[in-house]
């Protein structure tokens, strides 16, 4: 498939432009060693052509070395020289008249992705019917375009929504941020599994994954290894952890001989019941009650504390 060009010398229209060209696009990389060709072809071979870049306005003329113009090729220039510009065009002077080519928009392309971060990054638990929202943020060098793709258990999901957008970064920042948000409105058990977000510039791809656990319904239970008897000597620090399984995390309340325990300087009643310096009077039965905040289901467990006097 060969192409034949017929050049008609026209001093009133020295630059060749196809009918469809209102403006062109020139892609460049900020690379000291790379040259770029602005394809302002000429109908006349021995024109004095310069390249105008703006803004600010700068003019580049052929130097017989790395800057040149060829009627069959266009204007060649090191790409870093015009990387600041928003647009460029070629200009020819014929008998004190100026003729301009079409405008070419300058697009500087980068490719490097620094990292891809998922949020939440871990420990994601939901129950059937709840909404899953995962944010994937890619940090890149400037002048990068990003393509996102997600891989997850039910990729053909009817109720999923994907939104990609660029994030504003502080002026003077050396970095650009892109965000892709995956939303699944009502999760099912089949949505449980590994979720991977990949960000790609074309030359570099980075990905990150997180596991999403989907429970049939809210629940609460004690985990294995929950002690029933704890023995200590006077003066020791005692720690009794409330080992549980549950979604969402339960409310935890501790009682001693049926009386609610409140945290103070000698006792901390949280996920772990901590008695700073145990004394004889701390002997007794401690009850921990777990309450699921959604279903209000309760589970209780009694731990007997025996304190020995040496």
């Amino acid at each position: 498939a060969s192409v034949i060009y017929v050049y008609v010398q026209d001093y009133r229209s020295p630059f060749i432009a196809s009918v469809s060209d209102q403006h062109g696009v020139v892609y460049i990389t900020e690379n000291k060693n790379k040259t770029v060709v602005i394809p302002c072809l000429g109908s006349i071979s021995n024109l004095n052509v310069s390249l105008c870049a703006r803004y600010p306005e700068k003019r580049f003329v052929p130097d017989g070395n790395r800057i040149s113009w060829d009627s069959k090729k266009g204007f060649t220039i090191p790409s870093y020289m015009i990387s600041y510009a928003g647009m460029v065009f070629c200009e020819a002077k014929i008998n004190d008249e100026s003729y301009q080519s079409i405008m070419y928009i300058v697009v500087v392309v980068g490719y490097r992705i620094y990292d891809v971060v998922l949020s939440p990054s871990h420990g994601i638990e939901l129950s059937v019917g709840e909404k899953l929202v995962l944010n994937c943020t890619a940090r890149t060098e400037l002048n990068v375009g990003i393509d996102f793709n997600w891989e997850y258990p039910s990729s053909k999901h009817q109720h999923k929504k994907l939104v990609n957008r660029d994030l504003k970064t502080q002026s003077g920042s050396e970095m650009k941020k892109f965000l892709s948000t995956l939303t699944i409105d009502g999760v099912t058990r089949s949505d449980q599994g590994l979720y991977t977000c990949a960000a790609s510039s074309g030359l570099m791809t980075k990905k990150n994954s997180t596991f999403v656990r989907v429970h049939e319904k809210p629940f609460v239970a004690f985990g294995s290894g929950m002690e029933s008897l704890v023995e200590a000597t006077v003066g020791e620090r005692v720690r009794i952890p409330a080992k549980y399984l549950g979604y969402p995390p339960p409310e935890i309340k501790w009682y001693k001989n049926g009386i609610p325990l409140e945290s103070n300087h000698t006792i901390k009643a949280g996920h772990v019941l901590t008695i700073m310096e145990v004394s004889e009077r701390d002997t007794g039965n401690y009850t921990v009650i777990l309450t699921n905040p959604i279903s209000k289901e309760k589970q209780s467990h009694v731990v007997s504390l025996v304190v020995y006097v040496p």
Epitope: N31, N149, E151, A198, S200, G202, T205
Partner: antibody, heavy 117, light 112 residues
Framework: EVQLVESGGDLVKPGGSLKLSCTAS????????MSWVRQTPDKRLEWVAS????????YYADSVEGRFTISRENAKNTLYLQMNSLKSEDTALYYC??????????WGQGTSLTVSS | DIVITQNELSNPVTFGESVSISCRSS???????????LNWFLQRPGQSPQLLIY???TRASGVSDRFSGSGSGTDFTLEISRVKAEDVGVYYC?????????FGSGTKLEIK
Amino acid sequence: EVQLVESGGDLVKPGGSLKLSCTASGFSFSIYGMSWVRQTPDKRLEWVASISVGGSYTYYADSVEGRFTISRENAKNTLYLQMNSLKSEDTALYYCARELDGNYDYWGQGTSLTVSS
Amino acid sequence: DIVITQNELSNPVTFGESVSISCRSSKSLLYKDGKTYLNWFLQRPGQSPQLLIYLMSTRASGVSDRFSGSGSGTDFTLEISRVKAEDVGVYYCQQLVEYPFTFGSGTKLEIK
């Protein structure tokens, strides 16, 4: 097991066209960048083209810009290279390679293109 | 474009010995993020290239610890200790600091 299988290589006359395919299996194709790299008869490796995960961004070596087009069909786990206006210097073994972090971590076995009259 | 230079042949080596393969770049491959973007590949006879080392010194998954990479911004070395028959092939280095990514011409591991 990760597998990349190239096909479509042939003997073509200068100026002719050809389309190469690369079928991927054993991994999630849609979350990896993909590239074509060629090995010339003198055994030199030359990067040819690359494409982003969704196909929105493509890059080409200067020697093939405007003549070759890289594309992908994620639903079919397939990467393509459409080659037009072929020249004798395009004669090579064409590999498709999986890319992550810019690194080509898996390569196919290659498909051979000969451009000769 | 960045030019990567390699010797055509390594120093002749006997199985069980160590050998160094060198690679030189026309420009520093140390990027502003502090990482050096140089990769090493091995192409065994009749096979496709296999990634050995990335970021100058990090071994790719499944690669033997007999392979180690080192270097400065422009001069790099791949060290192979206790050379085995399976190490025979052509070793290529590649830069990833600047697009287009370029490869060296390859160094053939020569066995005595």
